[in-house]
Structure formats: structure tokens, C-alpha cells
Interface confidence: medium
């Protein structure tokens, strides 16, 4: 990633965290971690569309995009749009929706993020070729089983000892930014020199997000696909494709707190390779039937197969989902979901990468690009043996005709009964800041 992309990733996380609604009393400011970045980069080089089973106590989000190169705002957008489906007070996600990416982004106690990307001519587990894979790792872990992402309350009212409030986030006292003097900008003309401190908001190295995930995790395989013009697309279960509407502009986007927050696109959760029940297949694909079961726009668009349906620019996202408590890692128990839920059981880490233990026998509905709002309907997949996959569609909110449609994947697991929409700040579609 370029310096700009790193900063953009970090600052978008911090902006999203600062803007949570209800407000957070204990939200930590996040900063970039080069060790995590190196770890993420090393895994990205493996070109596997699945989570890193060696990641230990690190959270992980995945994103991939075809052809045009990395698009950090789009990645963030896809990870974050799930806020629409998450209810903080109930700690629930709307049935059939994903919320894990969002909860990682706003997990209050995560402080560090590191991301790396790699261009993969072939991404294992995805039919598309020439894909840029983004891996982000987080520490400390987020999505802890039975825990809410953050405590609701007056911003910074529950900052830990040794932290102070900055832009509604708890920032460590004595952090690199604080160690510096106030910013000064001295303008000089040939015969003029003066110094004056500018606004007190200090600026320094990127802060960062980190949502870590211990070795035992409840994660779902799910798929998500969006194309610029086609609402129904065939894809594999673990893949998530979303057309990147504007060409990649991550390097043209602001390198800091990008307030032109991305518009909302589909996100997708990947299977945890740490668990036996939801192992990512090395070669096994679970295709979505060519005909989707519901088109959420009045204008029906025929489904297409990958060969002719995918726009040159697509993206995929993946996230690790709910964690058991750190103390419970070694004995995380499988929990049966409510009837309306689709989730995977938790088992000790025993990887059987060749097995896909959840079968997909129902596909999500599709949505066309012209829909103005997120559809409330979704279709979940029935799974065998208590393990499940799910597919559903979500659509960018009021994005206009130039935005892609989306079929997104479910991300859910025990510890959270995913439920209704959370009234979070609805961010408008992305107009990349400073695009020229």
C-alpha cells in the first residue's frame, strides 16, 4: 500500500469510529502498525481468498478488487456499510445480514491496524483472474463473543487511564502525535518570515484500527457480488464481488481523515480457517445458481454467469467474525442459533482445508444498481450439520445509476443474535475528496 492508502485506511477507520451512533464512551483512537502490515502483506502474497489460519490473535479483514488496483475507500465502504444492519443495544444483526466487518471497524478496544496488498494473477478460491488482494490485520482482537463493540455514552467519558480525548476518540497520552509540538505553518515571502501556531489539532503518523481474532472464531462462508449493471451473478460461496465504480482512486483520495466517506457496498465474510466446521476449500466452490430467487428492483435484469457478467472492475471483501472470549478460546462452545439465524458452530482449530462442511442450497436474492435503498429482504442458505452459509443482497443506499448493484454475503455467528438495523450515521455515497 502507498503511504496515502495506509493513512486513508487508518483515518477512515478513525472517522467511522468517531462517528458511531449511538456515540461511544470508550472508543480508542487507532494507529498504524507496521508489524501487522508486514504480516498482512506476507499473507496477501499467498493469494488465497480465505483467512490466514496462522494469524493467531489477530483480526483479519479481506478485500479484493480486479484490474484497476486497490481502492481503499471501497474496501472500507464494504466493510462498514453493515452498520445499517447492526443494533448496538441489542447486539444483534438483521437476519441474513452481515455485521462482523462493521463491528470490527468500531470495536472500541482495538488500537492497531496493519494492511498489505498484493496483485494476484490467480486468487485461490475465486474464478476471476488478476485480482488485487488486500489483507488487514488488527490488534487487539475485536468481535469477542458476547461483547458489544463499544460502550454507548458520552464520547471519551470512559477513556482508559493514560488516555485523553481527541476528536471523540481516546488517544494515548504521550503518543507520537502528542510528543510533537503544536503544528506550525510558517509562510515566507522574500522579505517576510513569521511563525504562528495553527489550530491545536495535532497531526502525525497514521493512527489505526485493529480488530483481532483469536484462534477460535465463529465465521461464515458467504458470498457477495456486485456488478455495475448486472444484478444477478454466479459466484462461489466464499467470494464477494462488487464492481468498483470509479476507477481505483485510493491514491487520489485524501491521505487522512477522509470525510468523503465511501458509499455503501456489499461486504462479505470469509470462513475461518481456524475452525473445523467452516474450512475454506482449496478448490471446492459453491456456486450461486444462475437464477437468483429475488430481484429487488422492479426492473428485472437477467442473471449472468461470471464469464459475461462481471464488470472489469470488481471487488471482494471478507472478514473474520465473532470471537469467543479470550479466556474461552480453548473451550469455545457451539451455540445453536435462533431459527432466524444462520451461523457456524465453533470448534477447536483443526484445519481441514479440503473440506467445505457447509453446503449452500439456497441463494440470496439480487439487486439491481438502480435501487435507492437497502432492501430489507434477504435469503439465507440452509446448511448441513449445524454449519451454514448464507447469501443475501444489499444495495448501496441512494447511490444513483452509476453505482454498482450488490449481492452481499452474510457474516454472523454465535455470541451475537444479529438483528435489526442500527441507527448509525448514514453516510452519503462516496465522492472521493479532492478528485481531479
Amino acid at each position: 500500500l502507498t503511504d496515502e492508502e495506509k493513512r486513508l485506511m487508518v483515518e477512515l477507520h478513525n472517522l467511522y469510529r468517531a462517528q458511531v451512533s449511538p456515540t461511544a464512551s470508550d472508543m480508542l483512537h487507532m494507529r498504524w502498525d507496521e508489524e501487522l502490515a508486514a504480516f498482512a502483506k506476507a499473507y496477501a502474497r499467498q493469494c488465497v481468498w480465505g483467512h490466514n489460519k496462522e494469524r493467531g490473535r489477530r483480526g483479519e479483514n479481506l478485500f479484493a478488487i480486479t484490474d484497476e488496483g486497490m481502492d481503499v475507500p471501497l474496501a472500507m465502504e464494504e466493510w462498514h456499510h453493515e452498520r445499517e444492519h447492526y443494533n448496538l443495544s441489542a447486539a444483534t444483526c438483521s437476519p441474513g445480514q452481515m455485521c462482523g466487518h462493521y463491528t470490527q471497524v468500531v470495536w472500541a478496544k482495538t488500537e492497531r491496524i496493519g494492511c498489505g496488498s498484493h496483485f494476484c494473477e490467480k486468487l485461490q478460491g475465486v474464478e476471476e483472474t488478476n485480482i488485487e488482494l488486500l489483507v488487514c490485520n488488527y490488534e487487539p482482537p475485536g468481535n469477542v463473543k458476547g461483547k458489544r463493540p463499544y460502550q454507548e455514552g458520552t464520547p471519551c467519558s470512559q477513556c482508559p487511564s493514560g488516555y485523553h480525548c481527541k476528536n471523540s476518540l481516546c488517544e494515548p497520552i504521550g503518543s507520537p502525535e502528542d510528543a510533537q509540538d503544536l503544528p506550525y505553518l510558517v509562510t515566507e515571502a522574500p522579505s517576510f518570515r513569521a511563525t504562528e501556531a495553527s489550530d491545536s489539532r495535532k497531526m502525525g503518523t497514521p493512527s489505526s484500527l485493529a480488530t483481532g481474532i483469536p484462534a477460535f472464531l465463529v465465521t461464515e462462508v458467504s458470498g457477495s457480488l456486485a456488478t455495475k449493471a448486472l444484478p444477478a451473478v454466479e459466484t462461489q460461496a466464499p467470494t464477494s464481488l462488487a464492481t468498483k465504480d470509479p476507477p481505483s482512486m485510493a491514491t487520489e483520495a485524501p491521505p487522512c481523515v477522509t470525510t468523503e466517506v465511501p458509499s455503501i457496498l456489499a461486504a462479505h465474510s470469509l470462513p475461518s480457517l481456524d475452525e473445523e466446521p467452516v474450512t475454506f476449500p482449496k478448490s471446492t466452490h459453491v456456486p450461486i445458481p444462475k437464477s437468483a430467487d429475488k430481484v429487488t428492483d422492479k426492473t428485472k435484469v437477467p442473471s449472468r454467469s461470471p464469464e459475461n457478467s462481471l464488470d472489469p472492475k470488481m471487488s471482494l471483501t471478507g472478514a473474520r467474525e465473532l470471537l469467543p472470549h479470550a479466556q474461552e478460546e480453548a473451550e469455545a462452545e457451539a451455540e445453536l442459533p435462533p431459527s432466524s439465524e444462520v451461523l457456524a458452530s465453533v470448534f477447536p482449530a483443526q484445519d481441514k482445508p479440503g473440506e467445505l462442511q457447509a453446503t449452500l442450497d439456497h441463494t440470496g436474492h439480487t439487486s439491481s444498481k438502480s435501487l435507492p435503498n437497502f432492501p430489507n429482504t434477504s435469503a439465507t442458505a440452509n446448511a448441513t450439520g449445524g454449519r451454514a452459509l448464507a447469501l443475501q443482497s444489499s444495495l448501496p443506499g441512494a447511490e444513483g445509476p452509476d453505482k454498482p448493484s450488490v449481492v452481499s454475503g452474510l457474516n454472523s455467528g454465535p455470541g451475537h443474535v444479529w438483528g435489526p438495523l442500527l441507527g448509525l450515521l448514514l453516510l452519503p455515497p462516496l465522492v472521493l475528496a479532492g478528485i481531479f
Epitope: 510533537q180 503544528p183 505553518l185 489550530d199 462516496l430 478528485i435
Partner: antibody, heavy 112, light 104 residues
């Protein structure tokens, strides 16, 4: 301080920054005049992209923005100055799509 | 084009004041800066509703699309300044003409 320049003349402004990691930030020049109010002039981005630059239409071809990260400095070379270029010139850094910090400004007067 | 109104706002301390900024085209976010006489502008509110560091909680921002506002719940003497809205949803970065807040 400030400078008086005749129309058609040139001047180079400098801005020295401290207190933040200069190389991480996009540096801008904004000018202010009673007639035009606040007006964005130019921006230079980061080394990682070979320092791309952008200009307001009103100064394209006449002004050049540059930076020296080793000196925490950004510059504005202004050529073929016009009376309407008169104003207070601020350097400003941005880490997003708004300006986080502004310099104290220097006044440029273009008059014969 | 960014149009701010009113151009001048004269209020007593303790009053609630609201100034507006209208964009000719829809923008995703609005930012506000404060400028006091003889000083350079300061970032004041970013991303429509987020207060910059050090900005008193009596300030708030809201809006969407083409209409945005900055509100001060109880004006204090130190709030006397000119407030500019600014956007970069479209090229180039543009500023409003400013609302001058006077305290009686």
C-alpha cells in the same frame, strides 16, 4: 511583512511546517481577498505518487507549487502576477478534504 | 457555488444562533472553519458534524445534500468571528462567502 510586486512580476512564497509529520500531508495554498473571499489556489500531494499537483483554473500556467520534505517546506512560485492576485496567502495542510491547519499568512500586493 | 446566510449575524450572549450554507450541487459533507480578525482560519467542524479539537461543545453542525448549518447553542463573546463553510466533494475546494457573527 508582505510583498509588493508589479503586474507581470514574480514572487516565491515559502511555508515551513513543524509539529507534524510533514511528508504525510497534502500541502495547499489558499488566498483570501475582499473581492474573492477564500480561494483555494494549489495543492501538492505526496512523494509516494511523485508529488502530483493541482491548481485552480485562475492560476494554472502561472503558479507552481512544490515541496521539500527534507525541509518541511512548501513553496509557491508565482509568475506573471496580476492585480487580482493580491491578497493574503495561506499555506494549509490537509489530511482529508478539509484543511487541518493554516499558516499565519503573508500578504501579496500586485500593483504598479 | 456555496452561499452562506446571513452575511452578518448579530446576537446577544446566551442566544442560540444558526447559520446556513447552501451548495449549488449536492455535496457529501460540509466543513466549517472559523476566522477571527487578523488571524488565519481554523478548522472548526469537519464532516458536517464533527467538532475539531478544542472546539466547544456548544457548537454543532448538521445538514445533508445541498443544505448545511452550523449552530451555537449559547453564544459567547469569544465566538465572535467569521465562519466559512467549505467543501471538496467536487473539484475544486470551494468556500462559502462567510457569515460574520457579531456579539452585541
Amino acid at each position: 511583512g508582505g510583498g509588493l510586486v508589479q503586474p507581470g512580476g514574480s514572487m516565491k512564497l515559502s511555508c515551513v511546517a513543524s509539529g507534524f509529520t510533514f511528508s504525510y500531508y497534502w500541502m495547499n495554498w489558499v488566498r483570501q481577498s475582499p473581492e474573492q473571499g477564500l480561494e483555494w489556489i494549489a495543492e501538492i500531494r505526496l512523494q509516494s505518487n511523485d508529488y502530483p499537483t493541482h491548481y485552480a483554473e485562475s492560476v494554472k500556467g502561472r503558479f507552481t507549487i512544490s515541496r521539500d520534505d527534507s525541509k518541511n517546506s512548501v513553496y509557491l512560485q508565482m509568475n506573471n502576477l496580476r492585480p487580482e492576485d493580491t491578497g493574503i496567502y495561506y499555506c494549509a495542510c490537509r489530511y482529508a478534504d478539509y484543511f487541518d491547519h493554516w499558516g499565519q499568512g503573508t500578504t501579496l500586493t500586485v500593483s504598479s | 457555488v456555496m452561499t452562506q446566510s446571513p452575511a452578518i449575524l448579530s446576537v446577544y450572549p446566551g442566544e442560540k444562533v444558526t447559520m446556513t450554507c447552501r451548495a449549488s450541487l449536492s455535496v457529501s459533507y460540509m466543513h466549517w472553519c472559523q476566522q477571527k480578525p487578523g488571524s488565519s482560519p481554523k478548522s472548526w467542524i469537519y464532516a458536517t458534524s464533527n467538532l475539531a479539537s478544542g472546539v466547544p461543545a456548544r457548537f454543532s453542525g448538521s445538514g445533508s445534500g445541498t443544505s448545511y448549518s452550523l449552530t451555537i447553542s449559547r453564544v459567547e463573546a469569544e465566538d465572535a468571528a467569521t465562519y466559512y463553510c467549505q467543501q471538496w466533494s467536487s473539484n475544486p475546494f470551494t468556500f462559502g462567502s462567510g457569515t460574520k457573527l457579531e456579539i452585541k
